[in-house]
């Protein structure tokens, strides 16, 4: 259930974000693999932060667990992490609420796919299960996602653990979907993450040790109007050494029409290390931290080959 | 003009518990954490614990985990803060503060109830 | 737990006179800082908040300052009714905690 307001959407998928409190290293080492999880499926990024003014604070406040609702703006805003919501899932939740996502079972069209069951519900926490206001939710296309990492569980907020608030309303292959799962981002968690901060349709986040990526159907030419991009994220403290080991496509001055771009960071704005086209392999390029991006875009109909790469982290 | 009023002053022995109430006025009560924090006598401010009545759940300081128990009740806007095993270093004055509406980044304490001093003596 | 180190613990001044209090804290708490001033038999009350917001209703002299670890509350011009201890307190993380309090006292 996206938010509706772009004001609150991250410009660029830019989250810079700072670990506050006093959490373990273990806690910290949890919240970083949930922040890449969402990385490595959308192209939401998450920055240290240095001195932007919007950003998120791990931290831990009187609600437990809860995070404002994508960019409040003008400040730090507290993604609240309390005692037993240090766990994977749940941080990648609380992070779905950061990007921009309410609760799955609040969009205005819920009653079409869930019953919620009043009676069962704990006195005084009903409001967990008030529809949203139909302005407030955009899903941008998508169906109810009953294995969104934003759904509640069965029993969530019960009156007994045997007792289910919300009950979906129909068989999905041949059983009643469970719901509540807080184990991944699920397909439909992914693809409205991807349209609401509306990422290439093409590319990928690259996270292991070593890697290739390459152009669209290398090596059998690529069409018009491609925009790809390849996020490459190793751990902290590595660099990666990135090499074009093939490389054709239409040459114009300064690379205007087809290229590829690679720049030393993780977002459009890190500092350019170059820009190719034409047939020359460029020298191996090393990262100054552990993230490249790599963007390729084409205008012409002309076909090359395309381009393939490998790296790896150093 | 949200107003905070505790409960009367206490006189308590050692062991025993004491139940200290706060109640708002003048203004919506759920959605904000109610903090406890207490100063015993010439001594500092120490933050005990808070409730956001709407969530139902507390947070407690470490010193007082086990000790303490804040609750609250949504349909007379009373927030409780019950302290037991009192020892006489627990003599101090007791006061109920409004801070952050829960879904927001502040959490300040803006309004204050004016004490509830509790006496641990045999 | 996040430390919070007030200093100095109490200052002699006059009406008039600039008065300046620091807190650290014991790790960065970017701008989430308050500071309290309480006067005798009386409760806490909140006069700066996100480390340089004025709260509602407390004059212009009280300024605040800031960010990070190391914070500065100043009154510009020391009135009579000024006398007090003023507390900060970090409002980052939970169990939130409070310096150990500066005594303004008449000079």
């Known amino acids: 259930a996206a938010t509706s307001r772009p004001e609150r959407v991250w410009p660029d998928g830019v989250i810079p974000f700072v670990i506050g409190g006093n959490f373990t290293g273990s806690q910290r080492a949890v919240f970083r693999q949930a922040m890449r999880h969402w990385e490595k499926h959308t192209c939401v990024t998450f920055l240290e932060r240095t001195d932007e003014d919007s950003y998120i604070v791990f931290t831990y406040r009187p609600c437990g667990c809860c995070s404002y609702v994508g960019r409040r703006g003008g400040g730090p805003q507290a993604i609240s992490i309390g005692k037993n919501c240090d766990k994977f899932g749940i941080v990648v939740h609380e992070l779905g609420h950061v990007v921009g996502f309410w609760h799955e079972h609040t969009r205005p069209d819920r009653d079409r796919h869930v019953s919620i069951v009043r009676e069962n519900i704990q006195p005084g926490q009903e409001y967990n299960f008030l529809k949203m206001e139909p302005q407030e939710v955009e899903s941008l296309g998508e169906t109810y996602d009953f294995d969104s990492i934003m759904h509640y569980a069965r029993n969530t907020f019960s009156r007994g653990i045997f007792l289910d608030t919300i009950v979906p309303k129909y068989e999905v292959n041949g059983v009643k979907p469970p719901i509540g799962q807080r184990t991944r981002l699920s397909k439909g968690d992914i693809a409205q993450a991807r349209k609401l901060y509306k990422c290439p349709a093409c590319g990928e986040t690259l996270q292991d040790s070593t890697g290739n990526f390459s152009s669209p159907e290398y090596p059998n030419g690529y069409s018009a109007h491609m925009h790809c991009v390849w996020r490459i994220s190793v751990t902290p403290g590595e660099k990666i050494i990135l090499n074009f080991t093939s490389l054709d496509l239409y040459r114009s001055r300064l690379c205007w029409y087809d290229y590829v771009e690679v720049r030393d960071g993780f977002w459009r704005k890190a500092p350019l290390r170059g820009r190719f086209c034409g047939s020359k392999l460029p020298e191996p390029i090393v990262s100054t931290d552990s993230r490249l991006w790599v963007e390729f875009r084409s205008s012409s109909n002309w076909v090359g080959k395309g381009f393939f790469a490998v790296y790896e982290a150093i | 003009q949200v107003q905070l009023v505790q409960s009367g002053a206490e006189v308590k022995k050692p062991g025993s518990s004491v139940k200290v109430s706060c109640k708002a006025s003048g203004g919506t009560f759920s959605e904000w954490a109610i903090s406890w924090v207490r100063q015993a006598p010439g001594q500092g401010l120490e933050w005990m614990g808070a409730i956001i009545p709407k969530f139902g759940t507390a947070e407690y300081a470490q010193k007082f985990q086990g000790r303490v128990t804040i609750t609250a009740d949504e349909s007379t806007s009373t927030a409780y803060m019950e302290l037991s095993s009192l020892r006489s270093e627990d003599t101090a004055v007791y006061y109920c503060?409004?801070?952050?509406?829960?879904?927001?980044?502040?959490?300040?304490?803006?309004?204050w109830g004016k004490g509830t001093t509790v006496t641990v003596s045999s | 737990d996040i430390q919070m180190t007030q200093s100095p613990s109490s200052v002699s001044a006059s009406v008039g006179d600039r008065v300046t209090i620091t807190c650290r804290a014991s790790q960065g708490i970017s701008s989430w800082l308050a500071w309290y001033q309480q006067k005798p038999g009386k409760a806490p009350k909140l006069l700066i908040y996100a480390a340089s917001s004025l709260q509602s209703g407390v004059p212009s002299r009280f300024s605040g300052s800031g960010s990070g670890t190391d914070f500065t509350l100043t009154i510009s011009s020391l009135q009579p009714e000024d006398f007090a201890t003023y507390y900060c307190q970090q409002a980052l993380s939970l169990p939130y905690t409070f310096g150990g309090g500066t005594k303004v006292e008449i000079k």
């Open positions: 503060a409004r801070g952050a509406k829960y879904y927001y980044a502040e959490d300040y304490m803006d309004v």
